[in-house]
Interface confidence: medium
C-alpha cells in the first residue's frame, strides 16, 4: 500500500506581497503524474480555481492579472494523480499593499546610530490602525508585526532596537493595516535608511531576521512602548 501523495509546492511570482493593480502568478508544483491542479482560497468556496498541468505536467499556473482586495488571502493547492488527491501544500499568504494611505516612518533620536546604542523606529499612520509591520529591504520576512490585542486602534507603533549593531543598518519601510484582514496593507512608507557607525567592533553577524529589538528577545517581539498604551499593541513574529 502506497503512502499519501507528497504535498505540492506553492509560490507566487514576483512575490507574495503585491501592490494593488499589479499582476501576480501563483504556481503549484506537484509531480509528473499530476492530472489536474486545484487551488483553494481560505474562506472561499472550494475549489477557488482548477488548472490543467503545464508540460511536463509537474506544475500549474494560476494567473491574477490585476491584484485587488478580493485576491488577498491564504491559499493552498492540491494535485490529482491516478491514485487520488495529494496532501495540501503549505499555505501561501498573498498580501495586497495599497489598501490604505502610506504611514510615515522615522527614527528616534536619529537614523544615524552609533553601534552599541539604541534607536526606535516609529511608524505613524494618518488614521487609526490596529496592525503595523516593519520591513527591512532584502529580508526574507517582515521583521516585526505589531497587532492590537483588543481592537484598540492607534495612530502609531514603536519598534525599539537595542543594542544596535551593523546588522541593523539598512533600508526600512513600514505598513499599517486593519485587523479584519491581515492580507490588506497600506501603501509602504517612504524608505528610512538606518546608518550604523561603529564605535565598537561588530559582534559576529546574525541573520537579517535576527534584528534585536529592545533587548529582549533578540529576534522576537516585545511590548511596544512609549506612546502605545500598555493594553494596546503587542508584537508578533510572522
Amino acid at each position: 500500500q502506497a503512502g499519501p501523495l507528497p504535498k505540492p509546492t506553492l509560490w507566487a511570482e514576483p512575490g507574495s506581497v503585491i501592490s494593488w493593480g499589479n499582476s501576480v502568478t501563483i504556481w503549484c508544483q506537484g509531480t509528473l503524474e499530476a492530472r489536474e491542479y486545484r487551488l483553494d482560497k481560505e474562506e472561499s468556496p472550494a475549489p477557488w480555481d482548477r488548472q490543467n498541468p503545464l508540460e511536463p505536467k509537474n506544475k500549474a499556473r494560476f494567473s491574477i492579472p490585476s491584484m485587488t482586495e478580493d485576491y488577498a488571502g491564504r491559499y493552498r493547492c492540491y494535485y490529482r494523480s491516478p491514485v487520488g488527491w495529494s496532501q495540501p501544500s503549505d499555505p501561501l499568504e498573498l498580501v495586497m499593499t495599497g489598501a490604505y494611505s502610506k504611514p510615515t516612518l522615522s527614527a528616534l533620536p536619529s537614523p544615524l546610530v552609533t553601534s552599541g546604542k539604541s534607536v526606535t523606529l516609529l511608524c505613524q499612520s494618518r488614521s487609526p490602525m490596529d496592525t503595523f509591520l516593519l520591513i527591512k529591504e532584502r529580508a526574507a520576512h517582515p521583521l516585526l508585526h505589531l497587532r492590537s490585542e483588543h481592537g484598540a486602534q492607534q495612530h502609531q507603533a514603536e519598534f525599539p532596537m537595542s543594542p544596535v549593531t551593523s546588522v541593523h543598518g539598512g533600508t526600512y519601510r513600514c505598513f499599517s493595516s486593519h485587523g479584519f484582514s491581515h492580507y490588506l496593507l497600506s501603501h509602504p512608507s517612504d524608505p528610512l535608511e538606518l546608518i550604523v557607525s561603529g564605535s565598537l567592533e561588530d559582534p559576529r553577524p546574525s541573520p537579517t531576521r535576527s534584528v534585536s529589538t529592545a533587548a529582549g528577545p533578540e529576534d522576537q517581539p516585545l511590548m511596544p512602548t512609549g506612546s502605545v498604551p500598555h493594553s494596546g499593541l503587542r508584537r508578533h513574529w510572522e
Epitope: K117, S118, P160, S162, A214, A215, G216, P217, M223
Partner: antibody, heavy 117, light 110 residues
Framework: EQSVESGGDLVKPEGSLTLTCTVS?????????ICWVRQAPGKGLEWIGC???????TYYGSWAKGRFTISKTSSTTVTLQMTSLTAADTATYFC???????????WGPGTLVTISS | ELDMTQTPASVSEPVGGTVTIKCQAS??????LAWYQQKPGQRPKLLIY???TLESGVPSRFSGSGSGTEFTLTISNLECADAATYYC????????????FGGGTEVVVK
Amino acid sequence: EQSVESGGDLVKPEGSLTLTCTVSGFSFSSSYWICWVRQAPGKGLEWIGCIGTGSGSTYYGSWAKGRFTISKTSSTTVTLQMTSLTAADTATYFCVRGAGYSSYRLWGPGTLVTISS
Amino acid sequence: ELDMTQTPASVSEPVGGTVTIKCQASESVSNWLAWYQQKPGQRPKLLIYGASTLESGVPSRFSGSGSGTEFTLTISNLECADAATYYCQQGYDWDNIDNAFGGGTEVVVK
C-alpha cells in the same frame, strides 16, 4: 517563566567562580538578551553585562571587561565566569531577561558570592 | 562614560503624600529608561519602562516622565507598601558604560 541562579559560594581572594543561570518556561530557541546584575550587601544594583542567546553577542560594563565572561552553555543555561575575585566582588548575583526598552522584567532570586580568606 | 545619577539618596513622606525621584543621565538616553522597586531581601521589580510606560499590574499611583537626560518617578497617594529602594536604569547605551543603574533612592513612608 523564571530564571534561577546557582553556583554562589565562599571563595578565596584571587580565586575564580562560575555561576549558572537556568531558565524555565522558555528556552533560547528564541533569541533573548540574558544579563547579569549584581548587588553588594547594602549597596545598589550594578550592571555586569549581557549575552544575546541567538547571535552570541556580548556586552560588558567597562569595569567587568576581561575578568567576567558570559556564555550560553545550553538551550536553557547561561553562565557567568569570574576570575581574579576580590572582596569587592562579594555580592548577590542576579540573572535577568531583557524586555521592552532594554528593561529587565524577569529577575532570578539571586545567588550569593562571598570573597574572603 | 555614560553615568546615571539619582536624587535624593533618601526621602521620607507620610502616608497619602507624594514622592518625586529624579534620575539624570550624563548624556541623552532618549526614552530608554526604566524604574525598579526593591524591598529588603527581595529581587527588584520592574515598574516603568520606556520612561513612561507602566508595567502591567503596577498601580497607576506610579508614573514616569522625562526624555533625554532628565527623568522623574512620581509616587502619589503614598502607601506603607511603597517603602522600598527605587532604581533607575538606562538601556540606551550598552557599550561605554560603567553602570546602567542609578545609585538608588530609599523611600521611607511615615
